[in-house]
């Protein structure tokens, strides 16, 4: 990995042992101001592998609300507008970091947690297994 | 929002003011052990809206490596294997949380940051604007 010289103005770490505890400022800095304003919000409806969005809420997690994609069909929508089972709608998944309150119900103490979320769906050619 | 009774065993907060600073245990708990073992790793190649994955590395960020999807074509791959420009390949984007070292180069002090990442691509019907 890359070694970075330590800034002498860093706060002291209360806990030098692992599991490592760090200080995190929850005042979120949003880097998305310069992103393309063309939102992907309607892609779930216009895709050849359309999906529905389900709200997953957990007050012990930060962020407490995460939207999960569920593919609407097993197949994909073809040029005529029919569900075609020669192709498959599949979820595109991503591992994301969330903060889990630990101990539970504590407002100022968290543990980093990795969860797998389905972000949307894409249409793929199926893998065909030929039986000898 | 939902009000949760505070656990009396919570650690004290060093800073009661906003921007709120909290303690975070970086010993990641991975909730993905029970997820479907069928990985989406080859979907980028099998999709009708295929994408390439680009490595984005930033040692001042946690996680330091994030993979960004870039759609391979403007159109989508049709049944003949050709790029069809009557359809559009578009990136599926998601806002994710990362930790940014603040002050820079500090091992134990972070700020929460929201960034927009492209996770994969999907094939959509274009929006056609009819000129009167």
């Amino acid at each position: 990995g890359i070694t970075i010289p330590r800034n002498p103005g860093c706060p002291n770490s209360e806990d030098k042992n692992f599991p490592r505890t760090v200080m995190v400022n929850l005042n979120i800095h949003n880097r998305n101001t310069n992103t393309n304003p063309k939102r992907s919000s309607d892609y779930y409806n216009r895709s050849t592998s359309p999906w529905n969005l389900h709200r997953n809420e957990d007050p012990e997690r930060y962020p407490s609300v995460i939207w999960e994609a569920k593919c609407r069909h097993l197949g994909c929508i073809n040029a005529d507008g029919n569900v075609d089972y020669h192709m498959n709608s599949v979820p595109i998944q991503q591992e994301i970091l969330v903060l889990r309150r630990e101990p539970p119900h504590c407002p100022n103490s968290f543990r980093l947690e990795k969860i797998l979320v389905s972000v949307g769906c894409t249409c793929v050619t199926p893998i065909v297994h030929h039986v000898a | 929002g939902i009000t949760i009774p505070r656990n009396p065993g919570c650690p004290n907060s060093e800073d009661k003011n906003f921007p709120r600073t909290v303690m975070v245990n970086l010993n990641i708990h991975n909730r993905n052990t029970n997820t479907n073992p069928k990985r989406s790793s080859d979907y980028y190649n099998r999709s009708t809206s295929p994408w390439n994955l680009h490595r984005n590395e930033d040692p001042e960020r946690y996680p330091s490596v994030i993979w960004e999807a870039k759609c391979r074509h403007l159109g989508c791959i049709n049944a003949d294997g050709n790029v069809d420009y009557h359809m559009n390949s578009v990136p599926i984007q998601q806002e994710i949380l990362v930790l940014r070292r603040e002050p820079p180069h500090c091992p134990n002090s972070f700020r929460l940051e929201k960034i927009l990442v492209s996770v994969g691509c999907t094939c959509v019907t274009p929006i056609v604007h009819h000129v009167a």
């Epitope: 409806n45 216009r46 050849t48 359309p50 097993l74 005529d80 507008g81 029919n82 | 019907t125």
Partner: nanobody
């Protein structure tokens, strides 16, 4: 929630007309073919009429020249205009988006009787 809701069914005399509507919610119909099926008691479900995403229509042999399928993507609704109705058109009529693997409505009863 993704759903299709049919309306416009009812009791009509032979030779009469009805217009069925199929309103979609939770999704847009523009990417789908829109289809009307029917099922009479003791019979298999049969395709009555279909309109593709591009607007091409086709009809079951028994309803050709009497029924007309149409769609209004802006209203997110499909229609079935039924003229010169016969007693054998009596059935539950189902709206569908995307054909067999797609989205189905609950159905509306059409009864042709004097």
């Amino acid at each position: 929630e993704v759903q299709l809701v049919e309306s416009g069914g009812g009791l009509v005399q032979p030779g009469g007309s009805l217009r069925l509507s199929c309103a979609a919610s939770g999704f847009i119909i523009s990417i789908y073919s829109m289809n009307w099926y029917r099922q009479a008691p003791g019979n298999e479900r049969e395709l009555v009429a279909r309109i593709t995403r591009g607007g091409t229509t086709n009809y079951g042999d028994s309803v050709k020249d009497r029924f007309t399928i149409s769609r209004d993507n802006a209203k997110n609704t499909a229609y079935l205009q039924m003229n010169s109705l016969k007693p054998e058109d009596t059935a539950v009529y189902y709206c569908n988006a995307g054909a067999d693997g797609g989205i189905w409505g609950q159905g509306t009863q059409v009864t042709v009787s004097s």
